[in-house]
């Protein structure tokens, strides 16, 4: 994406088709792509999965992850609930969100810091992202205590969403 | 939205008119809808209410709610700055979001564990939700625990928005 | 921008061009600008700088500044990963948005509340805005607890992000 | 028009709390930050710290350790309390109103309204 | 919080336009645009004569006015009359939501 300085005197997208209308039109940004899921209703491993038959449009899903079908840069945004039976001992609840089986950013919340044993201790924690994707990218989340998510009383509390807001064309 | 293939053979938004220029032009998403609202000075319910005299574009305010004038995919935030008073017992924040009337997503924090009396006790809650709305859709909040939400010391920092991703004509 | 009551019988975006496709064309929503830093490495105030070498795309960066160049609505966002050291007494953690040197918004969470010396505490707190911004307007954060902001363990978790939602030609 | 009267003892003796109260007058309490600064004889201002009216506290660090402020928004008074009090406290003690107003962004006015302040001598 | 670092006097002759500086640190003036100045005649309350750093309260005299750049602010008052005569303080909003004031600048009228 090159920004004019002038929408008057400059084409709207680079090269050199600025009187030619459809070459314009079709260099524009106007892809969209975005996904909204849900976690799935039984975790069973740290890598989450997700519901297949949430929101995708642009994207794909395939065992737990998401993959992007078209280059470009995607907000990523995840958000998870938890409920946490407090143990003797504080309990750190972290969420990373990978790319290409990376870590590329996590976000750490400690609960039950008290050391009592309360009847549960909810927590809610957030993470985005803003980054260059490529076609086959995959997006996946991570939980070490994936158990605390409770995925029976908040079934849509836990989330995974991206849109793209630039193409690369 | 359709997403093409390759910018180059297809037309950008679907149907027949590759060809016609003002008809792929008045197709492509445009439109653009949005708001940022924060929270009403005095709150006396569950339900909360907002200053209308904030940013609103394309979208209406109405008894406490948003109103869709557009439909399309939407993207809602909702961040919350709470203020405790601790009690003997720990206490539960809790954030809804609700369309038309439903609860789509919530948030909780439990605070206040420890089950001391401290002076005061911050927290900050968001979130955040991706999804395709109709016309006169309503979008509001509801917090149980209203009296939480000091907007005297904060009024700035408890807000609704939205914005339009990708309209669906 | 203006918002078409029908994609079919008015101009995409006012005025009188609405038969002048490169007019319409040109005046259509196309920019793009956002940005994506990472914090610095070695933070010594209260006003958090800036990884320059991130994402920067129609917007410059300048002594911890994000600088405005094109005019519209921008989201703004910001996350901050803190690893806390539990003093005798609870910690009070802010973080603020400012605009041109002016407190936009901000968000409070106290840690360490139960005031016993544990080991560490990990806290996750965001913060956004959506607003107008004209050229030249800065965007900064400012973190009291700045020490609290552990760069070496977290390098890639605290985050300033924006991108332009609608520009305003 | 508002106006704040300081109120409370003159004289305090080492290692005792200080206590003072401001009432305000012609006005509400409500929607304003209180504030305390004092003034040594020919010396500058030191702000002491401020409280709203929902509770919220912000002290002088160098202070925080002695210094409570508490707020009665049925009797239109704040209070400062100052404790184990040395000579170094003796001053001038002003009660003040700090206006600040969210609305796009958070303007700070300033301290717009004070008392006519109150002298403090700790003596034993 | 150290205390912001004013002249301890400044002078000058009726007619005259006078600058007082005030320099702090990137935690309160480098960081935010909420610099105040209160003036304060002998045996008197202080009154706030400047907010965010060029805004004059109503009733207060157009000669007074007020800027800032990096971390030092700066007061002017010019057309010197002798009433200006008085002790002049700048007071600074903080990353730690507190405030903090100058040492003080005695304004002398010749």
């Known amino acids: 994406d090159s920004i004019p300085n002038s929408p008057d005197n400059v084409p709207l997208k680079g090269g050199d088709c600025s009187e030619d209308l459809l070459c314009i039109l079709k260099r524009a940004p106007f892809k969209k792509s975005w996904a909204y899921l849900q976690v799935a209703k039984h975790l069973d491993k740290t890598k989450l999965s997700w519901n297949k038959d949430g929101i995708l449009h642009g994207v794909r899903y395939q065992d737990g992850n998401l993959v992007i079908q078209f280059p470009g840069l995607y907000f990523i945004i995840c958000q998870l609930q938890f409920l946490v039976q407090c143990p003797q001992n504080s309990v750190d609840l972290k969420l990373e969100l990978l790319i290409n089986k990376h870590i590329k950013k996590q976000a750490l919340v400690t609960v039950c810091e008290s050391g009592m044993q309360t009847k549960h201790v909810y927590q809610n924690l957030s993470q985005f992202l803003l980054d260059y994707l490529q076609v086959d990218t995959t997006i996946s989340v991570n939980v070490d205590t994936f158990q605390y998510i409770d995925t029976s009383t908040f079934p849509l509390e836990n989330v995974l969403s991206i849109f793209l807001y630039s193409n690369s064309d | 939205d359709s997403i093409p293939n390759s910018p180059d053979n297809v037309p950008l938004k679907g149907g027949d008119c590759s060809e016609d220029l003002l008809c792929i032009l008045k197709r492509a998403p445009f439109k653009k809808s949005w708001a940022y609202l924060q929270v009403a000075k005095h709150l006396d319910k569950t339900k909360l209410s907002w200053n209308k005299d904030g940013i609103l574009h394309g979208v209406r305010y109405q008894d406490g709610n948003l109103v869709i004038q557009f439909p399309g995919l939407y993207f809602i935030i909702c961040q919350l700055q709470f203020l405790v008073q601790c009690p003997q017992n720990s206490v539960d924040l809790k954030l809804e979001l609700l369309i038309n009337k439903h609860i789509k997503k919530q948030a909780l924090v439990t605070v206040c564990e420890s089950g001391m009396q401290t002076k005061h006790v911050y927290q900050n809650l968001s979130q955040f939700l991706l999804d395709y709305l109709q016309v006169d859709t309503t979008i509001s909040v509801n917090v149980d625990t209203f009296q939480y939400i000091d907007t005297s010391t904060f009024p700035l920092e408890n807000v609704l928005s939205i914005f339009l991703y990708s309209n669906s004509d | 921008d203006s918002i078409p009551n029908s994609p079919d019988n008015v101009p995409l975006k006012g005025g009188d061009c609405s038969e002048d496709l490169l007019c319409i064309l040109k005046r259509a929503p196309f920019k793009k600008s956002w940005a994506y830093l990472q914090v610095a490495k070695h933070l010594d105030k209260t006003k958090l700088s800036w990884n320059k070498d991130g994402i920067l795309h129609g917007v410059r960066y300048q002594d911890g500044n994000l600088v405005i160049q094109f005019p519209g609505l921008y989201f703004i966002i910001c996350q901050l990963q803190f690893l806390v050291q539990c003093p005798q007494n609870s910690v009070d953690l802010k973080l603020e948005l400012l605009i041109n040197k002016h407190i936009k918004k901000q968000a409070l969470v106290t840690v360490c509340e139960s005031g016993m010396q544990t080991k560490h505490v990990y806290q996750n707190l965001s913060q956004f805005l959506l607003d107008y911004l004209q050229v030249d307007t800065t965007i900064s954060v400012n973190v009291d607890t700045f020490q609290y902001i552990d760069t070496s363990t977290f390098p890639l978790e605290n985050v300033l992000s924006i991108f332009l939602y609608s520009n305003s030609d | 028009q508002v106006q704040l009267q300081e109120s409370g003892p003159g004289l305090v003796k080492p290692s005792e709390t200080l206590s003072l109260t401001c009432t305000v007058s012609?006005?509400?309490?409500?929607?304003?930050?209180w504030t305390w600064i004092r003034q040594p004889a020919g010396k500058g201002l030191e702000w002491i710290g401020r409280i709203y009216t929902s509770g919220i506290t912000n002290y002088n660090p160098s202070l925080k350790s002695r210094v409570t402020m508490s707020v009665d928004t049925s009797k239109n008074q704040f209070s400062l309390k100052l404790s184990s009090v040395t000579a170094a406290d003796t001053a001038v003690y002003y009660c003040a109103r700090e206006r600040v107003v969210g609305a796009s962004r958070y303007y700070y006015y300033g301290v717009d309204v004070w008392g006519q302040g109150t002298t403090v001598t700790v003596s034993s | 919080q150290s205390a912001l670092t004013q002249p301890a006097s400044v002078s000058g002759s009726p007619g005259q336009s006078i600058t007082i500086s005030c320099t702090g640190t990137s935690s309160d003036i480098g960081l935010y645009d909420y610099v105040s100045w209160y003036q304060q005649h002998p045996d008197r309350a202080p009154k706030l004569i400047i907010f965010?750093?060029?805004n004059r309260p109503s009733g207060v005299s157009y000669r007074f006015s007020g800027s800032n750049s990096g971390n030092t602010a700066s007061l002017t008052i010019s057309g010197l009359q002798a009433e200006d005569e008085a002790d002049y303080y700048c007071?600074?909003?903080?990353?730690?939501?507190?405030?903090?004031f100058g040492g003080g600048t005695k304004l002398t009228v010749l």
């Open positions: 007071s600074s909003y903080t990353s730690s939501s507190t405030w903090v």
């Open positions: 965010e750093v060029n």
């Open positions: 012609g006005g509400s309490i409500s929607s304003y930050y």
